[in-house]
Interface confidence: low
C-alpha cells in the first residue's frame, strides 16, 4: 500500500487552530521516479456533504512529500469529507476523513467501519440531543433507510447492512428529519473485496494475518498498519509518537500523537495514533490495553508489563505477544518482515534461529508460496545463534507471496512468514527524446515510460555514432534530470538508447528502442573578456572569464585559455572543456615568470574571438641560485660545470637542472638533472666539437629555484660531431684531481 | 417484555418434513438479524441457519444445507425453519435466538442476546 | 472451517472456588468476536460475555473474559450455588459464521 497519512488535528475549541496535514512517506515522493509524478493534493471534498461556503482554505507545501490545510473560521467549515491523493500512476491513493460536528444532534459511535465482504455492517448513531422525529439514513448522499424514533436501542439508532459488498463502501449518514445536514452524524464504510482473510483476483489468496490491528489490503495481500506498528504483518511497535510504514514520521508537537486522528488508505480507514482513544483521541488507553484506538488488550503473562504504545514488554527469558513464550523455544530472529527480488535471479535468503537446544542446519526450512520447501546449503553456528543459507532457484514472478522460514527442535518450534517480492526489470517502452543538439553534445530527456517494475535506480544512455560497428559509449545518469552526451563529433548522427536498472542484483533491464539524434555546428561568435585572476602558488594561477549575456542558447563547446611566455617565446593552451565554466585553475607554471593570458570560446574546431588580453606576474620561488657557476672545457666533446650550493637554503636540496644551448642557436635549450645534491661538478659529455655553449643551472628542493648566472665556454676543435650532450657527475675535488 | 416462543417441534419418520415457527415479541422483529441452534440430548450447541433482517440474505450449517430453508415474515414477526428429509440426527432441541450488536472500544460485538425457550423435534421410526 | 475446543470438559469445584474455562480455536477469531453462555438443565442459553471480555447486561461481576486470536479464556473469581451449569464458547464471522465449542460442565465437588 501507498505510505500515505492524512492527520487531523482534533483541537476542536477553536476551529481556527485546526489542521489538516496530508504526509507521504513514498521513496523518492516527489524525487527521483516520482519527480514528474502529481503532487499531493488535500482538499474538501464537497460532493456529498455540503457546508455553506466560506473563505478558502489555506494549502501549505512543506516540500514534496507534506501538505497542510488550514483557515477554518467557523466550526461547520470542519465537517464534512476531506481527502488527500497521492503516489503515482497506478499507486495513486486516495486516503479519507470525515470530520462529525462535536455539537450534533446524532453521533457516530465509530466512524470508520472496516468489513468484509458478505459481512453484516452494523452503523449506530448515539442520540446527543434527541428529536422525536423520524432518522433518515443516507449512502453517498442518496436516500436509503428510515427509523422510527421509537427503535432507538440503548440511546442510538442503528443500520444494519446484511452480506455487504464493495458497491456498499462510502459515506453513510443519519440525520433527524427537520434537522441540519451538519447535526448528522457521518459515518465512512469499507468493504473489501473479499471475504475475512482473504485476498486476490477471486479472492483466493490467504491474507498473512495482519497483528495489531492491521488490515489485510484485498489487492494486493499486503497489511495496512496502524499508525505506530509496522512490518509485513504490522508485527513490530514504532517509538512513541512515530507513524508511517517505516516509523520515519513523528507527531507534531510536544504531546506526541495526543489529539490526532490518522488516516490510512482503504481498507484500514481512520484511527487515533497508538496509545490513545476517544472521539478526539485525547484519552490514553486505560491500563492492560494499547494500540491504535486502545483496541488490543496485552494479557501479558510471565512478569511481562504493558506498555500503551506497543503492548506487552517482556522480562529477560521470555518473548512473544504476551510473553507466552519461552526463550527455551527456538526462536527465528531477525527476519526480515519483506524481501525484494528481481526476476530471474538467485538470490541466497539467510535465516538465522537461536533455542535451546541449538538448532543445527538440518533444523530450519525455508517454505515457498507453492509449498515447495528448501533446505540450507550451508549453516553459519555462532554462539547465540545458527544462520541458515537457502539458494533460491531461479526466480519466477509466482514466487511472489508470503515465505516462511521455520525452525523444529525437540524444545518446539518457531516460524516466521515473510514477503517475498519479485519484480521484473524495467524496458524503456519508447526512445530518449532529444531537448537541445550542439556541435559536439547533445542533450537528452533520459525519462520513457516503461514496463517492469520501478523505481528506476539507474538509467544507462547507450550511444554510438550511426552506422558504427564500434563499442556503444555508455553514460549513467540521474533519471530525474537530463543529460547531456559530450565529446561527440560535430555533424554526426548518433545512434542512443536507454537501458534502465531498478534496486538490486539482476536488476537491469533490457535495452529501449534506439533513436537518432545529430550533432550541430554553428560558429562561435561572443568574445569573453577576463574578470580578473589571482595567484594560487608559484606555479598556480585562478583565472575567472564572463560572456556578454544575449538571448538564446550559448553556441560553444568550452574555452581556450592561451598564455605567452614572452622571455621564453612560448605558448601554453589550457582547453575548459565546459561552456557553463567561468572559471579556471591553471597548474604547472614557470614561477617568477611574465605571462600575457587570454581567453576565447570555441565551438567544434572554430575558435571565437579572443578577449582582450592580461598580463600577469607570477611570484619566483624555490631555493636561491646556485653560486660562482664556472664551465671549463676538457676536450672536443667535454665541458665541466663547477659551482658552490646556493646558500640560506630552507631545506635539502633535491637535485639542479643544468640548461644547455648552443649560443645563438634557435633550438629549444636541453635540461640535465644532476641527481646527487651534494655535488659541485659535473661534466657534460657529448658536445659537439668547436661549439660555443651557454649553460644555467638551478636547486630543486620542493620547486624549481631561481637559475644561477648565464656561463659561456667553448668545446675545444678537432673532434666529430657528437650525438648530444650528456652529464657525468663526481666530487668538484676529485674532478680537480684527474 | 422481549421474547421469542418456538414452536411446530414433535415426532416424525425419517425422511418425513417439519415446519418450525418462531414467535418475537417486545422489539422491532424487522431489524435483527435472527438464527436457530440446535442441541442434540446431551450434546452441545450445533448453530444450524441465520437470516438477516430483510429476508434476502440466508446461511446454513453444511450437515442442514439442501435439506433445511430459514424464512421469516417481517409483517407477523415471526421466523420459519423448514425441515425436510430428516434423518434420525436432527433430532434435537431447536432453539431460536436474536443478534444483537453490542459496541466496545474495539467495535461491533454480536451476540445472542434473547433465547426461545426451545422446541424438541424427534426424528425416529 | 474454524473448530472450537474447550477444556476441560468438566470442572468439579466448590462455592467460593475459581473457576478458569479454556477455550481455543483452530484458527485466528476475527476481531475478538466470542462469546461467552451459560446454560442451565431444561434452559435455553444465557449470554454472560461478548467481543471476549465485555460482560452482558446483568451478569454479575465475577464473571470475567479474556484472550484474543486463539485462545480465550473465562473465569468466575467466586462460585456461587447459581454458577454450576454448562458453558459455552461461540465464535462469530468466521466459517462457517458461528461456531459452538463443545462446552464445560462446571459441577459440585
Known amino acids: 500500500a501507498v505510505d500515505l497519512t492524512l492527520l487531523a488535528n482534533l483541537r476542536l475549541t477553536d476551529p481556527q487552530r485546526f489542521f489538516l496535514t496530508c504526509v507521504s512517506g513514498e521513496a523518492g515522493a516527489g524525487r527521483g521516479s516520482d519527480a514528474w509524478g502529481p503532487p499531493l493534493l488535500l482538499e474538501k471534498d464537497d460532493r456529498i456533504v455540503r457546508t455553506p461556503p466560506g473563505p478558502p482554505l489555506r494549502l501549505a507545501r512543506n516540500g514534496s512529500h507534506q501538505v497542510t490545510l488550514r483557515g477554518f473560521s467557523k466550526p461547520s467549515d470542519l465537517v464534512g469529507v476531506f481527502s488527500c491523493v497521492g503516489g503515482a500512476g497506478a499507486r495513486r491513493t486516495r486516503v479519507i476523513y470525515v470530520h462529525n460536528s462535536p455539537g450534533a444532534h446524532l453521533l457516530p459511535d465509530k466512524v470508520t467501519h472496516t468489513v468484509n465482504k458478505g459481512d453484516t455492517a452494523v452503523l449506530s448513531a448515539r442520540v446527543h440531543k434527541e428529536k422525536q422525529t423520524d432518522v433518515i439514513w443516507k449512502s453517498n448522499g442518496s436516500y436509503f433507510y428510515t427509523l422510527d424514533w421509537h427503535e432507538a436501542q440503548d440511546g442510538r439508532f442503528l443500520l444494519q447492512l446484511p452480506n455487504v459488498q464493495p458497491p456498499s463502501s462510502g459515506i453513510y449518514s443519519a440525520t433527524y428529519l427537520e434537522a441540519s445536514p451538519l447535526g448528522s452524524a457521518f459515518f465512512r464504510l469499507i468493504v473489501r473485496g473479499c471475504g475475512a482473510g482473504r485476498w486476490g483476483p477471486g479472492c483466493t489468496k490467504e491474507c498473512p494475518g495482519c497483528l495489531h490491528g492491521g488490515v489485510c489490503h484485498d489487492h494486493d495481500g499486503e497489511c495496512v498498519c496502524p499508525p505506530g506498528f509496522t512490518g509485513t504483518r504490522c508485527e513490530q511497535a514504532c517509538r512513541e509518537g512515530r507513524f508511517g510504514q517505516s516509523c520515519q514520521e513523528q507527531c507534531p508537537g510536544i504531546s506526541g500523537c495526543r489529539g490526532l486522528t490518522f488516516c490510512l488508505p482503504d481498507p484500514y480507514g481512520c484511527s487515533c495514533g497508538s496509545g490513545w482513544r476517544g472521539s478526539q483521541c485525547q484519552e490514553a488507553c486505560a491500563p492492560g490495553h494499547f494500540g491504535a484506538d486502545c483496541r488490543l488488550q496485552c494479557q501479558c503473562q510471565n512478569g511481562g508489563t504493558c506498555d500503551r504504545f506497543s503492548g506487552c514488554v517482556c522480562p529477560s527469558g521470555w518473548h512473544g505477544v504476551h510473553c507466552e513464550k519461552s526463550d527455551r523455544i527456538p526462536q527465528i530472529l531477525n527476519m526480515a518482515s519483506e524481501l525484494e527480488f528481481n526476476l530471474e535471479t538467485m538470490p541466497r535468503i539467510n535465516c538465522a534461529a537461536a533455542g535451546n537446544p541449538f538448532p543445527v542446519r538440518g533444523s530450519i526450512e525455508l517454505r515457498k508460496p507453492d509449498g515447495t520447501v528448501l533446505l540450507s546449503t550451508k549453516a553459519i553456528v555462532e554462539p547465540e545463534k545458527t544462520t541458515a543459507e537457502f539458494e533460491v532457484p531461479r526466480l519466477v514472478l509466482a514466487d511472489s507471496g508470503f515465505w516462511e522460514c521455520r525452525v523444529s527442535t525437540s524444545g518446539g518450534q518457531d516460524s516466521r512468514r515473510f514477503k517475498v517480492n519479485v519484480k521484473v526489470p524495467p524496458v524503456p517502452l519508447a526512445a530518449p527524446r532529444l531537448l537541445t543538439k550542439q556541435s559536439r553534445q547533445l542533450v537528452v530527456s533520459p525519462l520513457v515510460s516503461f514496463s517492469g517494475d520501478g523505481p528506476i535506480s539507474t538509467v544507462r544512455l547507450h550511444y554510438r555514432p550511426q552506422d558504427s560497428t564500434m563499442d556503444w559509449s555508455t553514460i549513467v545518469v540521474d533519471p530525474s534530470e537530463n543529460v547531456t552526451l559530450m565529446n561527440l563529433r560535430p555533424k554526426t548522427g548518433y545512434s542512443v538508447r536507454v537501458q534502465l536498472s531498478r534496486p538490486g542484483e539482476g536488476g537491469e533491464g533490457a535495452w529501449g528502442p534506439p533513436t537518432l539524434m545529430t550533432t550541430d555546428c554553428p560558429e562561435p561568435l561572443l568574445q569573453p573578456w577576463l574578470e580578473g585572476w589571482h595567484v594560487e602558488g608559484t606555479d598556480r594561477l585562478r583565472v575567472s572569464w564572463s560572456l556578454p549575456l544575449v538571448p538564446g542558447p550559448l553556441v560553444g563547446d568550452g574555452f581556450l585559455l592561451r598564455l605567452w611566455d614572452g622571455t621564453r617565446g612560448q605558448e601554453r593552451r589550457e582547453n575548459v572543456s565546459s561552456p557553463q565554466a567561468r572559471t579556471a585553475l591553471l597548474t604547472g607554471l614557470t614561477p617568477g615568470t611574465h605571462y600575457q593570458l587570454d581567453v576565447q570560446l570555441y565551438h567544434c574546431t572554430l575558435l571565437g574571438p579572443a578577449s582582450p588580453p592580461a598580463h600577469v606576474l607570477l611570484p619566483p620561488s624555490g631555493p636561491p641560485a646556485p653560486r660562482h657557476l664556472h664551465a671549463q672545457a676538457l676536450s672536443d666533446s667535454e665541458i665541466q660545470l663547477t659551482w658552490k650550493h646556493p646558500e640560506a637554503l630552507p631545506g635539502p636540496i633535491s637535485k639542479y637542472v643544468v640548461e644547455v644551448q648552443v649560443a645563438g642557436g634557435a633550438g629549444d635549450p636541453l635540461w640535465i638533472d644532476v641527481d646527487r645534491p651534494e655535488e659541485t661538478s659535473t661534466i657534460i659529455r657529448g658536445l659537439n666539437a668547436s661549439t660555443r655553449y651557454l649553460f644555467r643551472m638551478r636547486a630543486s628542493i620542493q620547486g624549481l629555484g631561481d637559475w644561477s648566472n648565464t656561463v659561456e665556454e667553448s668545446t675545444l676543435g678537432n673532434g666529430l660531431q657528437a650525438e648530444g650532450p650528456v652529464q657525468e657527475s663526481r666530487a668538484a675535488e676529485e674532478g680537480l684531481d684527474q | 417484555e422481549v421474547q421469542l416462543l418456538e414452536s411446530g417441534g414433535g415426532l416424525v419418520q425419517p425422511g418425513g418434513s417439519l415446519r418450525l415457527s418462531c414467535a418475537a415479541s417486545?422489539?422491532?422483529?424487522?431489524?435483527?438479524?435472527m438464527i436457530w441452534v440446535r442441541q442434540a440430548p446431551g450434546k452441545g450447541l450445533e448453530w444450524v441457519s441465520r437470516i438477516y433482517p430483510s429476508g434476502g440474505g440466508t446461511e446454513y450449517a453444511d450437515s442442514v444445507k439442501g435439506r433445511f430453508t430459514i424464512s421469516r415474515d417481517n409483517s407477523k414477526n415471526t421466523l420459519y425453519l423448514q425441515m425436510n428429509s430428516l434423518r434420525a440426527e436432527d433430532t434435537a432441541v431447536y432453539y431460536c435466538a436474536r443478534v444483537t450488536y453490542y459496541y466496545d472500544s474495539s467495535g461491533y460485538q454480536p451476540a445472542f442476546d434473547i433465547w426461545g425457550q426451545g422446541t424438541m423435534v424427534t426424528v425416529s421410526s | 472451517d474454524i473448530q472450537m475446543t474447550q477444556s476441560p470438559g468438566t470442572l468439579s469445584l466448590s462455592p467460593g472456588e475459581r473457576a478458569t474455562l479454556s477455550c481455543r480455536a483452530s484458527?485466528?477469531?476475527?476481531?475478538?468476536?466470542l462469546a461467552w453462555y451459560q446454560q442451565k438443565p431444561g434452559q435455553a442459553p444465557r449470554l454472560l460475555i461478548y467481543g471476549a471480555s465485555s460482560r452482558a447486561t446483568g451478569i454479575p461481576d465475577r464473571f470475567s473474559g479474556s484472550g484474543s486470536g486463539t485462545d480465550f479464556t473465562l473465569t468466575i473469581t467466586r462460585l456461587e450455588p447459581e454458577d454450576f451449569a454448562v458453558y459455552f464458547c461461540?465464535?462469530?464471522?468466521?466459517?462457517?459464521?458461528?461456531?459452538f465449542g463443545g462446552g464445560t460442565k462446571v459441577e459440585i465437588k
Open positions: 484458527q485466528s477469531v476475527s476481531g475478538n468476536l
Open positions: 461461540q465464535q462469530y464471522g468466521g466459517s462457517p459464521p458461528v461456531t
Open positions: 417486545g422489539f422491532t422483529f424487522s431489524s435483527y438479524l
